[in-house]
């Protein structure tokens, strides 16, 4: 009796199973039953990444550098080229198809993370007793200066943008 | 017991004709593709044309395409060659052999089709 | 068209001995190949199919090898019944093609 259901790596056509092509080959003709599928290797910047019956490879993915985009891994006939962003850009999506400059944390905030080439800054705001006083991709809240360590004394408060203000002790005569 | 019996050779003049049978028993005919092969005296095996379980499918090498015919009556569990503008290169024993995994698992004892003028 | 080749032409051994016969294709076929026995005024018998799988009915002497181009059937120990001609057929496309065979000869 013919099959109505066919093994893992197989398909059915014609009532009868048929090998599926390996990944990073294409289908070119369906088997019969005297010949096995007929499967052809992927050409050049080509891909199929699945056990497949695909008559077409899938072109590689393109890092347009206009994107800001870069190859991070090459692909093969049985992968995708994957793609990250240039120095100083992070892509804006999971796919990366296109990517955006990173995100400078504001005076107040300081970097809580550094920007990757897939995931923006994340900035978080200075707590009491820290401050940042520039916009900057890198720069961590930094803590404020402590004036007694200097044998000095406080003479202007520092806020989350700014540093302390130090000065000498009044001396009594 | 699965068996294949070729009929029909003979003695043909080159442009003649000739019609082999190939008569199966012991299995469900109509479950299994076959194919004709063919052997030219003290030569090796040629693949000659193959045929479909229900018939809707035929295939050929290049050289016999549009000379030779393959077709199959599963009403009656038999096999044909029809083969015209024979050559003296069509010399051969012909046998039948059924697929099988796509693989020829049984075949049967071959007829002698000797093209001379 | 895949040409396969076989080789030796002739394997002239002794009953007892191992017998080692190629067949190399002309590209790719993965484990589509099958292997066939003749023996003089009789049809071929399938010996091995998808390159090494065994055959209900053949002695486990006979056992195959091999994928994509280069395929072999050994025999262990020949027997005298072993003295034939064997072929390798290809079935990854059309049209189907069988090696030119291999004689396997008493010496």
């Known amino acids: 009796e013919p099959p109505t259901a066919c093994r893992e790596k197989q398909y059915l056509i014609n009532s009868q199973c048929c090998s599926l092509c390996q990944p990073g080959q294409k289908l070119v003709s369906d088997c019969t039953e005297f010949t096995e599928t007929e499967c052809l290797p992927c050409g050049e910047s080509e891909f199929l990444d699945t056990w497949n019956r695909e008559t077409h490879c899938h072109q590689h993915k393109y890092c347009d550098p206009n994107l800001g985009l870069r190859v991070q891994q090459k692909g093969t006939s049985e992968t995708d080229t994957i793609c990250t962003c240039e120095e100083g850009w992070h892509c804006t999506s999971e796919a990366c198809e296109s990517c955006v400059l990173h995100r400078s944390c504001s005076p107040g905030f300081g970097v809580k993370q550094i920007a990757t080439g897939v995931s923006d800054t994340i900035c978080e705001p200075c707590p009491v007793g820290f401050f940042s006083n520039v916009s900057s991709a890198f720069e961590k809240c930094h803590p404020w200066t402590s004036c007694e360590t200097k044998d000095l004394v406080v003479q202007q408060a520092g806020t989350n943008k700014t540093d302390v203000v130090c000065g000498p002790q009044d001396r009594l005569r | 017991e699965v068996q294949l019996v070729e009929s029909g050779g003979g003695l043909v003049k080159p442009g003649g004709s000739l019609r082999l049978s190939c008569a199966a028993s012991g299995f469900t005919f109509s479950n299994y593709g076959i194919s004709w092969v063919r052997q030219a005296p003290g030569k090796g095996l040629e693949w000659v044309a193959s045929?479909?379980?229900?018939?809707?499918?035929?295939y050929y090498p290049d050289n016999v395409k549009g000379r030779f015919t393959i077709s199959r009556d599963n009403a009656k569990n038999s096999l044909y060659l029809q083969m015209n503008s024979l050559r003296a290169e069509d010399t051969a024993v012909y046998y039948c052999?059924?697929?099988?995994?796509?693989?020829?698992?049984?075949w049967g004892q071959g007829t002698l089709v000797t093209v001379s003028s | 068209e895949i040409v396969l080749t076989q080789s030796p032409a002739t394997l002239s051994l002794s009953p007892g001995e191992r017998a080692t016969l190629s067949c190399r294709a002309s590209q790719t076929i993965n484990n589509n190949l099958h292997w066939y026995q003749q023996k003089p005024g009789q049809a071929p018998r399938l010996l091995i199919k998808y390159a090494s799988q065994s055959i209900s009915g053949i002695p486990a002497r006979f056992s195959g090898s091999g994928s994509g181009t280069d395929f072999t059937l050994t025999i262990s120990s020949l027997e005298p019944e072993d003295f034939a001609v064997y072929f390798c057929?290809?079935?990854?496309?059309?049209?189907?093609?069988f090696g030119g065979g291999t004689k396997v000869e008493i010496k």
């Open positions: 052999a059924r697929a099988g995994e796509k693989a020829m698992d049984y």
């Open positions: 057929q290809q079935f990854s496309s059309w049209p189907l093609t």
């Open positions: 045929i479909s379980s229900g018939g809707d499918n035929t």
